[in-house]
Interface confidence: low
Amino acid sequence: AQGKEVVLLDFAAAGGELGWLTHPYGKGWDLMQNIMNDMPIYMYSVCNVMSGDQDNWLRTNWVYRGEAERIFIELKFTVRDCNSFPGGASSCKETFNLYYAESDLDYGTNFQKRLFTKIDTIAPDEITVSSDFEARHVKLNVEERSVGPLTRKGFYLAFQDIGACVALLSVRVYYKKCPELLQGLAHFPETIAGSDAPSLATVAGTCVDHAVVPPGGEEPRMHCAVDGEWLVPIGQCLCQAGYEKVEDACQACSPGFFKFEASESPCLECPEHTLPSPEGATSCECEEGFFRAPQDPASMPCTR
């Protein structure tokens, strides 16, 4: 089953209302509004390509972590080709850096670079060259990174510009859950995905109504992977005597049918010379004057 995403931060959906911090104050990153497809879109942009030694930071607002253990960061951005500037702008770069910092409280406007840990250098797959730009055809790049395990109450992300011409159009931060699942007649609850790729969270399932773990069988278990996918089912539940599997549930045998043990088999029609069974029968009684030997299976007809 596909992982479920729980969004913690969505810059594009906020309509420019988030008010992220820029550092140093009054330099570098700037919030801009553009009209695209007749809709206003907001972006953070920086383009100090002519001046060397750029160190401009953009920090998100404090994000409450909640139950997230590993977060995923999806960035949509576009980068201009350094060759589109006068003299190729010798100090121009085509990458920027992504950082994060965990904290138990919101530091507000108190920004300290030393608290941030680098996640990665973000490089575009495609750069926007002059001809594209003049035609307003910007090359949109999508990059995703993940960080975990997170342990504090919340976190910040930060973007460091080192002299590129970048427009950051979307920043989406989310965590993943393995969705509620019915499999093998067992119910598995919605589960927060683990934080470490090698370790899979083991989740015990509970048998659905009228299902049981067969004698000697393994309890139902599944593993919730980091990406929110359920993996490696172990064990199973079977419909108990008098019930058969219909889709993901156990349904009582219809009148005139029976099932004598917990198994994968469906309900069987009552054999010859038996009385009509009620709903949910585990066996069919013999008609008067007809009998079965004690060792005979319930599926055997009754005889005189």
Epitope: D30, L31, M32, Q33, V46, R80, G87, V166, A167
Partner: antibody
Amino acid sequence: QVQLQESGGGLVQPGGSLRLSCAASGFTFSSYSMNWVRQAPGKGLEWVSYISSSSSTIYYADSVKGRFTISRDNAKNSLYLQMNSLRAEDTAVYYCARYRLPDFWSGYPNYGMDVWGQGTTVTVSS
Amino acid sequence: QSVLTQPPSVSGAPGQRVTISCTGSSSNIGAGYDVHWYQQLPGTAPKLLIYGNSNRPSGVPDRFSGSKSGTSASLAITGLQAEDEADYYCQSYDSSLSGHVVFGGGTKLTVL
């Protein structure tokens, strides 16, 4: 038509304060960065301050840093310059001008200050 | 003392061609920053005359042209007319300065 109109100038004593305003009309004010530029009597143009469209980026000339504060109210289509601790050398005609700074779309500033107000006179004298 | 250097004055007879220079350095014009030119008629606010080194805003006659080379830029006016008598300012950006914006000291053009 596109227009900028300054107001708030006047005579003030050294150490005093003034607040200049610039009312914009005829264009989408919230999409443009703005500047204040001044011109002392008989002298050339001197750039004073810059504010980006969203107020997130602000610059000042070294000569006014710490004394002047630029701000804007996009809902009112207005630009302001709060001038404190005024000195005799701040005496000038103050102009507001529409402008763009480097960003992804302009690449680098190549539009210049394309719209100017008519100016307001500030005289600092005892 | 301006970061961009302009001659204090130039003059020419009607119909003549005059040029006004604007000399910078490697941290401004020489770094690839654009140069803009403004005209200030007596008693009026400055008006954008040339932007992005050589572009004319609509309404500016083609008698005015701009160019840039190395660390310098120049404004040329051909077919000089009496109404061209004004102060002319170049403007660029300097990566070494707070706020970047720099003006030349201005040149007074006199039409003889």
